[in-house]
Interface confidence: low
Amino acid sequence: LQSQGVSLYIPQATINATVKEDILLSVEYSCHGVPTIEWTYSSNWGTQKIVEWKPGTQANISQSHKDRVCTFDNGSIQLFSVGVRDSGYYVITVTERLGSSQFGTIVLHVSEILYEDLH
């Protein structure tokens, strides 16, 4: 995806996971200068910001995801020990200063490990 000088690549737009897995929401971006990266989470319960940061600086992680997420300078984030309630839409927005911006979405499906699946 490209817009106004920001390009954003999402290698896997849908991720299926089971509870307690650590999940990488993987992206790649390119732009002029150092952007601001913002991840938000949307579900039937509403939308909330997860984290915002400029690569190379400390990330501002929301209270709801403290100790549950880590960031990478390529824009990716990792979610630790996911639960079913983490299922939903994860939207990344990469913004160059006060202008150029691009967004992309990853859909995460988290399911319980069923007893039958183990046999």
């Epitope: 927005t93 913004t95 202008g99 150029s100 992309g104 979405t105």
Partner: antibody, heavy 121, light 112 residues
């Protein structure tokens, strides 16, 4: 529920000043960039100015640069537009709008109902 | 700076579908845009943000009847099962480094 309520519009003579306010509620005001957009009678929408979430970055349309100043008071959840040296062509309904993001000026996911500014002698 | 071009008017019958077009200027075909609706005597309302690949994210409470798509430098807003309250002005908007640009708007009339 997100609400943006503009005030401060009215009739003003050319060359005079006016300050518009926008009271925000229903979201974390200090986390988002904010815009002013205007609409002259019977015309389309025209972007006026944007300010980043912390007030550190401001941008203006060429038509108002040097005359208008956008500012915000995060402790009061209020956005302002100081309009100086007003001209007849500044006559419009002025809308305050919330950006979807905090630093980037992208698009607006909520709008106010607007306040009418009429510049006439 | 990008320029957005919209037809000044469009019309369609109640219950039918209509497709509104927003054209990006040469050299800006990769830009994302947004669509906003303005009903008579009201403030604008955000409908959706639309990427160059057609992916889009809609605003709160926007019905499924509204959808977006893209082809080259064209950005589309499709409204299906038209209702009387869809009669409104529709604006596309885009953004760049420190600037915001609106199209001229399309006035949609819902017939009969």
């Amino acid at each position: 529920e997100v609400q943006l309520v503009e005030s401060g519009g009215g009739l003003v003579q050319p060359g005079r000043s006016l300050r518009l306010s926008c009271a925000a509620s229903g979201f974390t005001f200090s986390s988002y960039a904010m815009h002013w957009v205007r609409q002259a009678p019977g015309k389309g929408l025209e972007w006026v100015a944007v300010i980043s979430y912390d007030g550190s970055n401001k941008y203006y349309a060429d038509s108002v640069k040097g005359r208008f100043t956008i500012s915000r008071d995060n402790s009061k959840n209020t956005l302002y537009l100081q309009m100086n040296s007003l001209r007849a062509e500044d006559t419009a309904v002025y809308y305050c709008a919330k950006d979807q993001y905090s630093v980037g000026a992208t698009t607006y996911d909520y709008w106010g109902q607007g306040t009418l500014v009429t510049v006439s002698s | 700076q990008p320029v957005l071009t919209q037809s000044s008017s469009a019309s369609a019958s109640l219950g039918a579908s209509v497709k509104l077009t927003c054209s990006l200027s040469s050299g800006h075909s990769s830009y994302a845009i947004a669509w906003h609706q303005q009903q008579p005597e009201k403030g604008p309302r955000y409908l959706m943000k639309l990427n160059s690949d057609g992916s889009h994210s809609k605003g709160d409470g926007i019905p499924d009847r509204f959808s977006g798509s893209s082809s080259g430098a064209e950005r589309y807003l499709t409204i299906s099962s038209l209702q009387s309250e869809d009669e409104a002005d529709y604006y596309c908007q885009t953004w760049g480094s420190g600037i915001q640009v609106f199209g001229g708007g399309t006035k949609l009339t819902v017939l009969g």
